[in-house]
């Protein structure tokens, strides 16, 4: 048993038939001696009397809410959480697995630059009765602070019969070194407790290894004279590293036709502009990936041809 | 570039970009079997890192950027030397169309561009590395493709920048 | 084409000291280990140990430390092997072996202890 | 060290019959195990390498399988010319070492 927080507790427990549990020995928070009775969660059942309480928790069942009283007044109260392993493994039952970029993918996050500043998101199809609590740090042996907002809702989608909800939460490295070269990972760590079942997901990665940047914008095309060709440019992100001469972006230009098995033409380019043929009801894309760093592309940003 | 003259920044951007596409070419392609149940052996932490004290960004390149050429130049060193080691020359071969051959030979390249002959910096003392159980190899080339790769983009990072601003 | 060149047999006294050469031709030699086998006559293969041409780097069985001495001279492609304090144990068949996994070994050479 | 156990010592064969050689270490070596053949008085020719992979130019006949600690090597149809010793080896760890040799010949 460890205090999550105050008055907060979390059982360990091995979840098999007939497991015999973990006894727990709960102590009133007073200076009072006797008369101290012990109930469970709403129930009027007194549990057992004296300044300490000991239990068996073997289920759900004996989780909650146990609270001490004398002569009708609430003294304090001890919330027992239970965190499930079953064959060795905790459980993972109130996040969904992504299974991307791997399986048992619970958290992901994305970074739009090296300022040190990331999002993580998770998904799970619980509508109430949810709290999750987000730390993270560089590190985890001497850990250098990062400082994590409150987790938020962030979307919900209908996936066939189920609704699926996406929580998010915005971190931010406090002394950041967006020209380093990351030697010790982010941890980011999730508490998530669904009624009294408590659990914890992970993640740990390197800011470079999570970039995606924004779409490169004001995607422009200029016709160039007597020619079917044009000649499009478009600018670094807002949002990319400073400066550019020294985070830069590498760029693919797509001319991709109406019809989605029209072959796509493709160039590479270092540069800001390119000049490619523009198909009738084509459509002009162009996205980004730093330039020396093979992380993610950004999205596509899109123009028509017409 | 020892005592203080400019190292050659375009050839130096054009080497080191080509360096990072090797890095990335060569990551997959490190020999003929699967990782398996290879054990996380702990044996890449003592690689040079460029860190922020050693005036790589664009400040510290404009202040002087010896100190960060310096730094590139030991991490470049080791990394040669990782390179030809038997973590890479042992079983199991490189496949045959592996590229660590050339990354190899460019992080020479790049090295002594830096410090051409006759002139010398203080480089790091490159530990000895003792030979390497074979079943250890392929997770150890993982491990170091996938430190340099990071290595190197920041070292591109520099010389492009340098290239752009600090040429004559 | 790959291929490992031996030396040729040697006839050696009892307590002398011999030193046999592996000639690399075909790769560049410092990309591989070299592997040095003794073999008894009708006898199995025994492994001796290994050098990393590029950086001089050895490892032996510990059975043939003191016993054998692994060197390289990348200016030639030639890798080395010395046996010293010879005993009529010593007499056998030695290979050089480029890496386990690829079929390059060399023709072998001959030692024969005798008085 | 790694001890590599072969059986059998000797096995004598009918061109055309199908048959498995025996290698077991003594402690798990995952797929570091190769094959040579020897013919007197050659030196040992590569088989199979780790554990299953052919090697070019080696009939396909050949094949080997196995992990952990038992591996085998199957020659599907023995010719006259596959008369040889036969040697595992453990590619796992130092020392390296070989099998004593499975003896292949011909009724």
């Known amino acids: 048993i460890w205090e999550l927080k105050k008055d907060v507790y979390v059982v360990e427990l091995d979840w098999y038939p007939d497991a015999p549990g973990e006894m727990v020995v709960l102590t009133c928070d007073t200076p009072e001696e006797d008369g101290i009775t012990w109930t469970l969660d709403q129930s009027s059942e007194v549990l057992g009397s004296g300044k300490t309480l000991t239990i068996q928790v073997k289920e759900f069942g004996d989780a909650g809410q146990y609270t001490c009283h004398k002569g009708g007044e609430v003294l304090s109260h001890s919330l027992l959480l239970l965190h499930k392993k079953e064959d060795g493994i905790w459980s993972t039952d109130i996040l969904k697995d992504q299974k991307e970029p791997k399986n048992k993918t619970f958290l992901r996050c994305e970074a739009k630059n090296y300022s040190g500043r990331f999002t993580c998101w998770w998904l799970t199809t619980i509508s109430t009765d949810l709290t999750f609590s987000v730390k993270s740090s560089r590190g985890s042996s001497d850990p250098q602070g990062v400082t994590c907002g409150a987790a938020t809702l962030s979307a919900e989608r209908v996936r066939g019969d189920n609704k699926e909800y996406e929580y998010s939460v915005e971190c931010q490295e406090d002394s950041a070194c967006p020209a380093a070269e990351e030697s010790l990972p982010i941890e980011v760590m999730v508490d998530a407790v669904h009624k009294l079942k408590y659990e914890n997901y992970t993640s740990s990665f390197f800011i470079r290894d999570i970039i995606k940047p924004d779409p490169p914008k004001n995607l422009q095309l200029k016709p160039l004279k007597n020619s079917r060709q044009v000649e499009v440019s478009w600018e670094y992100p807002d949002t990319w590293s400073t400066p550019h001469s020294y985070f830069s972006l590498t760029f693919c230009v797509q001319v991709q036709g109406k019809s989605k098995r029209e072959k796509k033409d493709r160039v590479f380019t270092d540069k800001t502009s390119a000049t490619v043929i523009c198909r009738k009801n084509a459509s002009i894309s162009v996205r980004a990936q730093d330039r020396y760093y093979s992380s993610s592309w950004s999205e596509w940003a899109s123009v028509p041809c017409s | 570039v020892p005592g203080g003259s400019s190292p050659a920044w375009t050839q130096c951007q054009q080497l080191s970009q080509k360096l990072c596409t090797l890095a990335w070419s060569a990551h997959p392609l490190v020999g003929h079997m699967d990782l398996r149940e290879e054990g996380d052996e702990e044996t890449t932490n003592d690689v040079p890192h460029i860190q922020c004290g050693d005036g790589c960004d664009p400040q510290g390149l404009r202040d002087n950027s010896q100190f960060c050429l310096q730094r590139i130049h030991q991490g470049l060193i080791f990394y040669e030397k990782l390179l030809g080691s038997d973590i890479f020359t042992g079983e199991p071969s490189l496949l045959p169309d592996s590229p660590v051959g050339q990354l190899h030979a460019s992080l020479l390249g790049l090295s002594q561009l830096l410090q051409p002959e006759g002139h010398h910096w203080e480089t790091q003392q490159i530990p000895s590395l003792s030979p390497s159980q074979p079943w250890q190899r392929l997770l150890l080339r993982f491990k170091i493709l996938r430190s340099l790769q990071a290595f190197v983009a920041v070292a591109a990072r520099v010389f492009a920048h340098g290239a752009a601003t600090l040429s004559p | 084409e790959v291929q490992l060149q031996q030396s040729g047999p040697e006839l050696v006294k009892p307590g002398a000291s011999v030193k046999m050469s592996c000639k690399a031709s075909g790769y560049t030699f410092t990309s591989s280990i070299i592997h040095w086998v003794k073999q008894r006559p009708g006898q199995g293969l025994e492994w001796i140990g290994y050098i990393n041409p590029y950086d001089d780097v050895t490892k032996y069985n510990e059975k043939f430390k003191g016993k054998a001495t692994l060197t390289s001279d990348k200016s030639s492609s030639t890798a080395y092997m010395e046996l010293s304090s010879l005993t009529s144990e010593d007499s056998a068949v030695y290979y050089c072996?480029?890496?386990?996994?690829?079929?390059?070994w060399g023709q072998g050479t001959l030692v024969t202890v005798s008085a | 060290d790694i001890v590599m156990t072969q059986s059998p010592a000797t096995l004598s064969v009918t061109p055309g019959d199908r048959v498995s050689l025996s290698c077991r270490a003594s402690?798990?070596?995952?797929?570091?195990l190769h094959w040579y053949q020897q013919k007197s008085p050659e030196s040992p020719r590569l088989l199979i390498k780790y554990a299953s992979q052919s090697i070019s130019g080696i009939p396909s006949r050949f094949s080997g399988s196995g992990s952990g600690s038992d591996f085998t090597l199957s020659i599907n149809s023995v010719e006259p010319e596959d008369v040889g010793v036969y040697y595992c080896q453990n590619g796992h760890s130092f020392p390296f070492t070989f099998g004593s040799g499975t003896k292949l010949e011909i009724k």
């Open positions: 402690q798990s070596i995952s797929v570091y």
């Open positions: 072996a480029r890496r386990w996994d690829e079929s390059y």
